[in-house]
Amino acid sequence: MAVTACQGLGFVVSLIGIAGIIAATCMDQWSTQDLYNNPVTAVFNYQGLWRSCVRESSGFTECRGYFTLLGLPAMLQAVRALMIVGIVLGAIGLLVSIFALKCIRIGSMEDSAKANMTLTSGIMFIVSGLCAIAGVSVFANMLVTNFWMSTANMYTGMGGMVQTVQTRYTFGAALFVGWVAGGLTLIGGVMMCIACRGLAPEETNYKAVSYHASGHSVAYKPGGFKASTGFGSNTKNKKIYDGGARTEDEVQSYPSKHDYV
């Protein structure tokens, strides 16, 4: 029961995490700037991975997409790539984990197959979460680096001048959404991997002992091991496969401890 709960919880946590990663990737507030030396109106600028927006105190708001890839820094492209890889891996992981869920029956899928699928989806969630955390962290680092750079004149010429404007910048909401979402996806992935261990059928060293009290004859079948006295050939308790002989467990299959829905 604990395995099913762990798997189910891991799935739900990962689902929330991936939804958060998608939301963060689409959000415009990755970074925000308040323009200080503006003699006209208070200008609040915010930018995402795909577009930049400006909002003025008058209520005017305008967004403009980055239609060119050339003018954008490689770091921004890298962040986009990391977030997209995270979303794709997470989506595939969700798809795989749906079929791996213990509470969902698909044909005669064995526990070993479900365990493998659970592990696969868990690893995908972990990588997805790491991608998101890495992407958000790279962007945050880019922000800090850029804004600690000197605000000296960038160039002068023809009597004109270009210099950086002193602005107050803050980490946008999308960064925090991304960090939390990445963390949740990571935790969900770890939970799936833990659940996988419980799902994997244990290689038992002995077959179940079956007792039958039918009338006068009492059958005792110790299965594949011979009682070792130290004098026989099986001194190291190696499993002895008894050709065609079958134990009661093999003749009639009872529901195993992993078969409940």
Epitope: L35, N38, V43, N45, V54, F60, G160, M161, V162
Partner: nanobody, 121 residues
């Protein structure tokens, strides 16, 4: 790189009118605020008028009723219509723009080279 080019300056009689233009060119993503500043010989550069991307305007007290600022966002161009000019309006008029550069995630303050306005009889 963003460049600003002013035009329209010249010699005008007191009470006359002039229209200044400021055109932005280069690798522009978005210019949020544009403004006009002036600097008379031997004086500090002072703010004349400004206009935001949304059309909000602000004027220095000395020019409030006489000057009108406007802009064309599509052309990245700003205009300053100067009426009832006085001799104290004689100065070099400089165009200023605050442009957002997504490449560096920062604002750039761009200045033009200036155009001279002389009000004299």
């Amino acid at each position: 790189e963003v460049q600003l080019q002013e035009s329209g300056g010249g010699l005008v009689q007191p009470g006359g009118s002039l229209r200044l233009s400021c055109a932005a060119s280069g690798n522009i993503f978005r210019i949020d605020t544009m403004g006009w500043y002036r600097q008379a010989p031997g004086k500090q550069r002072e703010f004349v008028a400004g206009i935001s991307r949304g059309g909000s305007t602000n004027y220095a007290h000395s020019v409030k009723e006489r000057f009108t600022i406007s802009r064309d966002n599509a052309k990245n161009t700003m205009y300053l219509q100067m009426n009832s000019l006085k001799s104290e309006d004689t100065a070099g008029y400089y165009c200023n723009a605050q442009a957002w550069d997504p490449g560096t995630i920062r604002y750039l303050e761009v200045w033009g080279q200036g155009t001279l306005v002389t009000v004299s009889a």
